[in-house]
Interface confidence: low
């Protein structure tokens, strides 16, 4: 399921314009496209240009993160007069040009979406024949990837004074709420750490002191689903070890 905020009835809304109004460079992209992890998404991008009948060599580029300087995720080149844009780069083989650059369409399909794909993408076209010109979307399209929760790590770790603490890390978008349950706990919402830089979809909850032996279950939930995982604490009484 893919949602795209776009309305072709208003040119200036999502259009970035350069040059004179009569014949100008412009790029039309929606501000946001949403899709679920595992699915595919289409990033629309169309353009106009002032070089009326240009049929020389062209290059289509998509980059991620930021315009002009972000890493390229896709690049293809079309020879003079050709409508075939030969792929030169497709990061992890998951990016494929849907549009025809000769027909002013750079739309890109992204396969097998992951949470890491949730970022802003920028399309660019370069002419390199008798005309040398280029234009790049400055504001780009935000790809918003949603995902049901997944617990990526659950563990019991030693704490000072022969105590133990439990950590549960989950990912999802929207970021999942985490809850611990276990012996003498009932249902505890535990301390949730802020997502770490560069790991915006990861949430960690800690149980700082495990006071009883038994099974401790971490549940992660968001609007798309829930997931749970358990660890077991069994202390060898009289010793300082634990079995998990």
């Amino acid at each position: 399921f893919v949602r795209t905020k776009i309305d072709t009835t208003e040119n200036l809304l999502n259009t970035e314009v350069h040059s004179s109004p009569a014949q100008r460079w412009s790029m039309q992209v929606p501000p946001e496209v949403s899709a679920e992890a595992g699915d595919a998404a289409v990033l629309p991008c169309t353009f106009t240009h002032p070089h009326r009948h240009y049929d020389g060599p062209l290059t289509a580029i998509w980059r991620a993160g930021e315009p002009y300087a972000g890493p390229q995720v896709f690049r293809c080149a079309a020879a003079r007069g050709s409508e075939l844009c030969q792929t030169a780069l497709s990061l992890h083989g998951r990016f494929r040009l849907l549009g025809n650059p000769r027909r002013n369409d750079l739309s890109l399909r992204v396969e097998r979406l992951a949470l890491a794909d949730d970022r802003r993408y920028f399309c660019r076209v370069e002419f390199a024949g008798d005309v040398h010109d280029r234009y790049e979307s400055r504001h780009g399209v935000r790809l918003h990837v949603t995902a049901a929760p997944r617990i990526v790590n659950i563990s019991v770790l030693p704490s000072p004074a022969h105590a133990f603490r439990a950590l549960c890390t989950a990912e999802g978008e929207p970021p999942p709420a985490l809850a611990w349950s276990g012996p003498a706990l009932g249902n505890s919402l535990a301390a949730v750490r802020s997502p770490r830089e560069g790991h915006g979809h990861l949430v960690t909850a800690e149980l700082p002191a495990l006071t009883h032996d038994g099974r401790y279950t971490c549940t992660a939930a968001n609007s798309l689903g829930r997931s749970e995982a358990s660890v077991y604490l069994f202390r060898f009484h009289g010793a300082s070890g634990a079995s998990t």
């Epitope: 200036l12 999502n14 970035e16 400055r138």
Partner: antibody
Framework: EVQLLESGGGLVQPGGSLRLSCAAS????????MSWVRQAPGKGLEWVST????????YYADSVKGRFTISRDNSKNTLYLQMNSLRAEDTAVYYC???????????????WGQGTMVTVSS | DIQMTQSPSSVSASVGDRVTITCRAS??????LAWYQQKPGKAPKLLIY???SLQSGVPSRFSGSGSGTDFTLTISSLQPEDFATYYC?????????FGQGTKLEIK
Amino acid sequence: EVQLLESGGGLVQPGGSLRLSCAASGFTFSSYAMSWVRQAPGKGLEWVSTISGGGVYTYYADSVKGRFTISRDNSKNTLYLQMNSLRAEDTAVYYCAKAIGSSWYSDAFDLWGQGTMVTVSS
Amino acid sequence: DIQMTQSPSSVSASVGDRVTITCRASQDISSWLAWYQQKPGKAPKLLIYVASSLQSGVPSRFSGSGSGTDFTLTISSLQPEDFATYYCQQSYSIPYTFGQGTKLEIK
């Protein structure tokens, strides 16, 4: 001269309505997204709403969604904010602001009006 | 929503001082950050956009830097007219959000 001039503020009771206007001059009004930004007394700035150049797209802060309506009349170079079901927490100076670029997803607000005070009180 | 956090909330300085104000975003906003100056009873004035571009007519003693989540506004040599409140604002995504402001006062 490039400028924005707000009007329509005043004292209104909770649950009441007001319509703010912002008259633009000195630039091609229809080419730019316009926004309303407010500032409660002694507080910081809060974005309220944005409308795209042609008026097709409108966006609102959660705090005003369903109560406020942004609109524009490009033939009159005027931006509006219709405020219904007003609450005490809507008390603020309301500024209209122009986006720096012609794309709706613009970087910043490069032109601001002088502001109009809205007081919601019984 | 993206939260913008400015520090410090207030700073005292003297004419001629170099002053730095920082702004942190709760998530990566690339370079989509603006800085504004506001004086009491007046509308905000744009100083810097896309993190480091100086708005036309703004003195060159103002500069901006940063990308991602951490940004800085620097005033290289304070002038008497610079004492005001400064706000950062992200335009990476709607809702646009502002920092809480940094009040620059005379020492």
